[in-house]
Interface confidence: medium
């Protein structure tokens, strides 16, 4: 059920997945919606507690039943992820936040005219996730007009504090406004030897690229295909970064593919959702439910309609013993990161992903021709 | 259960695995945490006994129940390993110990300005594990400013004595501060013919390399793969060293792989923990428990959550018709050195390691680009 209403002075009890810091309840809901498992959130508004270090905390929550008990809490704002909702969702957040300092790794500072120009700098820098700009009213004269570009491991600030004379905001890459080069090539027989920031399991290089695009710090990736010689690394998608933003070393290796995040692109293809079916493929993960349905499309629909389902494996009916009505068995699954824990072949399954992320693809997806 | 508290004037009774010498209770706990089986320790502080040769003894202990009886002992400090704890653990120890002489094989001496420079020399020498530096206050004028580089078979001093005018400490290689060449290549079809200091069983060359990296004196290794002609040597990981620090002879042999310890590297990959699953592979060892679980991920999690479990083999349930809950059987295992005693194939098991050592990977693992 889709619940768009937020509940003021209410906290959801239990179900904590993690805590991040966001400048508003709206942005907290956006983070929850994009998180692989978050279904509910509680946001601690400014002055919600005597301890300012707890202000702006966005507590991401999950529940097997998709609901949690509500308790009264002054200054808390609680609500539900938009995973359960049909509407188109944008990952783009153009809001700026006055008198808020969003803390992160300050890796670049420069003097610019205004906050808009600072946001543009952030949008046009490969590493930048958010920024803080010291306005002409900032108390320290030496720091006025200073634009700080920032990133964190998670893509959200490590903390947020009140600070007069500053304006903060997020990169507009996901609004399709980056002028950085969009590199769509996928390079066959290529391993990129830079820093692995994360690794996930993926069925193909296109899913790996989408995961990289959706990841806060991934700039490029290497994917090891099913034919990769080292069995334990098959289907491994290595999410990578480097200081320069470009890979430093390219190694030629068969059965590996590499490419770049599409975060700078005006998307002509889906970058969040993975619509394909993968034949003779089992996605392993945490089993959520097993239902009998007719056909893999229905299985995918069932997964999409279940807010906690991330991916599925469907076994067509001929695999069942005393098969009656040509229904197959649909295994609904999830994992901590939204990706299968393992991918197996030769067991007769047909696997795929929930389509609930499709509605997060930016509006350009259906408007811009591929180059 | 994680217990961070230490117990003063208390000794744990029984469960002894081995005794090493460490300059502090903190370092004793570090050694216990890294030891494959140690769960508890008792450290004999200075003046803990009338016999100075017993001072600084660090007694590593194990217990099937994970607890041991406590007895009063003046000067003893007892506590628990951090294996049971969730926090990130560093193998890096920057402390220096004033007026303590840490004994070992003195293989190099030179005159340097201060203790920091001596520690840097140690960090930038392949063999050096710890050092003793004679300060300007050392009684013997001839030996002042002398920096002694040391190693032992275990990586810890053979004994520790009180000695005025000296400062001792450990190499900072595990802090990612070594300037020595980091050699990441793994060489196929290669046997290195130098001194074997130890041998363990490993599923692949990457695990072999991690074990070498974690070993106090291993500088390089040779691994015999599953296809190695001599059956008794298959999956054998030979840990090696040489006087020069580099291999002297390289022999071309099919189905063998060789490489180097990553102790000098600023790690971009885990070097302590072995996260992969090994399909159609049985790890043999001492059985700790057998539990029915859903999936190899749960089996690995069960192993990780058991402080004594080092590795496991999981046998999936077959896709039977009237199968109810798709549980497989999870065998939790351990051995004296943390590695399987044998590795077998073709029996349908899925094997892997406890992930508890992952938290020992140094912080650089996720932060520093590979050199």
């Amino acid at each position: 059920e889709c619940v768009t209403k937020v509940f003021k002075d209410i906290s959801f009890q239990g179900g904590d997945l993690s805590t991040v810091f966001t400048p508003s309840a709206t942005y907290c809901r956006l983070v929850c919606t994009h998180h692989p498992r978050c279904l509910l959130f509680t946001f601690m508004a400014e002055s919600s507690s005597d301890d300012p270090t707890k202000w702006f905390a966005c507590i991401l929550k999950d529940s097997v039943t998709e609901i949690l008990p509500m308790v009264n809490m002054t200054g808390a704002i609680s609500g539900y992820s938009f995973k359960q909702c049909p509407q188109q969702l944008s990952t783009c957040s153009k809001d700026v936040y006055v008198n808020l300092d969003m803390k992160g790794m300050n890796y670049n500072s420069s003097v610019v005219k205004n906050a808009r120009e600072c946001q543009e700098r952030c949008t046009d820098d490969a590493h930048c996730q958010f920024f803080t700009y010291a306005t002409g009213y900032f108390p320290s004269v030496d720091h006025r007009k200073m634009c700080l570009l920032k990133y964190t491991r998670t893509g959200t600030p490590t903390t947020i504090t009140k600070l007069n004379g500053v304006v903060s905001g997020f990169s507009l890459k996901s609004c399709g406004l980056s002028n950085l080069a969009c590199i769509r090539d996928i390079f066959p027989n290529t391993v990129l030897a830079d820093l692995n920031i994360d690794s996930v399991v993926a069925p193909d290089a296109f899913v790996c690229r989408r995961i990289c695009t959706h990841h806060p710090t991934c700039l490029f990736f290497t994917f090891f295909s099913q034919a990769w010689p080292k069995e334990s690394q098959r289907h491994l998608c290595l999410l990578k970064t480097s200081e320069s933003g470009l890979p430093s070393t390219r190694i030629t290796k068969s059965h590996a593919l590499s490419g770049f995040s599409l975060q700078h692109c005006r998307h002509s293809v889906p970058v969040f959702c993975h619509p394909s079916f993968y034949n003779d493929t089992d996605f392993l993960g945490e089993e959520l439910d097993i239902v009998d349905v007719k056909g893999q499309e229905t299985c995918q629909k069932t997964c999409t309609n279940n807010a906690r389902c991330q991916f599925f494996t469907y076994y067509p009916s001929h695999r069942l013993c005393n098969e009656r009505n040509r229904r197959g068995r649909c295994y609904l699954k999830l994992s901590s990161n939204g990706s299968p824990t393992r991918i197996l072949h030769g067991r007769g399954g047909i696997s795929g992903y929930s389509l609930r992320l499709c509605k997060m693809d930016n509006v350009c997806t259906t408007k811009i021709n591929p180059r | 259960e994680c217990v961070t508290k230490v117990f003063k004037d208390i000794s744990f009774q029984g469960g002894d695995l081995s005794t090493v010498f460490t300059p502090s209770a903190t370092y004793c706990r570090l050694v216990c945490t890294h030891h494959p089986r140690c769960l508890l320790f008792t450290f004999m502080a200075e003046s803990s006994s009338d016999d100075p040769t017993k001072w600084f003894a660090c007694i590593l202990k194990d217990s099937v129940t994970e607890i041991l009886p406590m007895v009063n002992m003046t000067g003893a400090i007892s506590g628990y390993s951090f294996k049971q704890c969730p926090q990130q653990l560093s193998t890096c120890s920057k402390d220096v110990y004033v007026n303590l002489d840490m004994k070992g094989m003195n293989y190099n001496s030179s005159v340097v300005k201060n203790a920091r420079e001596c520690q840097e020399r140690c960090t930038d020498d392949a063999h050096c594990q710890f050092f003793t530096y004679a300060t300007g206050y050392f009684p013997s004028v001839d030996h002042r400013k002398m920096c002694l580089l040391k190693y032992t078979r275990t990586g810890t001093p053979t004994t520790i004595t009180k000695l005025n005018g000296v400062v001792s400490g450990f190499s900072l290689k595990s802090c990612g501060l070594s300037n020595l060449a980091c050699i990441r290549d793994i060489f196929p079809n290669t046997v290195l013919a130098d001194l074997n200091i130890d041998s363990v069983v490993a599923p692949d060359a990457f695990v072999c390399r991690r074990i070498c990296t974690h070993h106090p004196t291993c500088l390089f290794f040779t691994f015999f793969s599953q296809a190695w002609p001599k059956e008794s040597q298959r999956h054998l990981c030979l840990l090696k060293t040489s006087e020069s620090g580099l291999p002297s002879t390289r022999i071309t042999k099919s189905h063998a792989l060789s490489g180097f310890s990553l102790q000098h590297c600023r790690h971009s990959v885990p070097v302590f923990c072995h996260p992969s699953f090994y399909n159609d592979t049985d790890f043999l060892g001492e059985e700790l428990d057998i539990v029915d679980v859903k999936g190899q991920e749960t089996c690995q999690k069960t192993c990780t959550n058991n402080a004594r479990c080092q590795f496991f083999t999981y046998y999936p349930s077959h896709r039977l018709c009237n199968e109810r809950n798709r549980r497989g059987r999870c065998y939790l295992k351990l051995s004296s050195n943390g590695s399987p005693t044998r590795i077998l194939h073709g029996r349908g098991g899925i094997s892997g390691y406890s992930l508890r050592l992952c938290k020992m990977d140094n912080v650089c693992t996720t932060k520093i680009n590979p050199r």
Epitope: N179, R184, D185, F187, E243, L246, R250 | -
Partner: nanobody, 124 residues
Framework: QVQLQESGGGSVQAGGSLRLSCAAS????????VGWFRQAPGKKREGVAT????????YYADSVKGRFTISQDNAKNTLYLEMNSLKPEDTAMYYC?????????????????WGQGTQVTVSS
Amino acid sequence: QVQLQESGGGSVQAGGSLRLSCAASGYTFSNNFVGWFRQAPGKKREGVATIYTLGSSTYYADSVKGRFTISQDNAKNTLYLEMNSLKPEDTAMYYCAAARGWVSPLDPARFVYWGQGTQVTVSS
């Protein structure tokens, strides 16, 4: 020391063609952004075409799309600009430039190494 040396400029009638070359030393084209920029008298330096040399990603200014083609020869460590259907407004000093890191492809501010330039003059 990085050195970029342009050649191939000259005078040509409108509608004609030229091929510019840029030879690099002290810098490898194998995995970087390299490009062509131009500056007409009294005007700002502007991006013409850029290539990401690991693959086939190319970026062109709207004014040259369909007429100019950028390419590279990694073996020779050389960058090229094939210019067809030249127009008088293409008259400018043409510079080869190389970057260090990710760039806005036609933004000269992001390029750190520059050649001395080669003059292209197109008469009507």
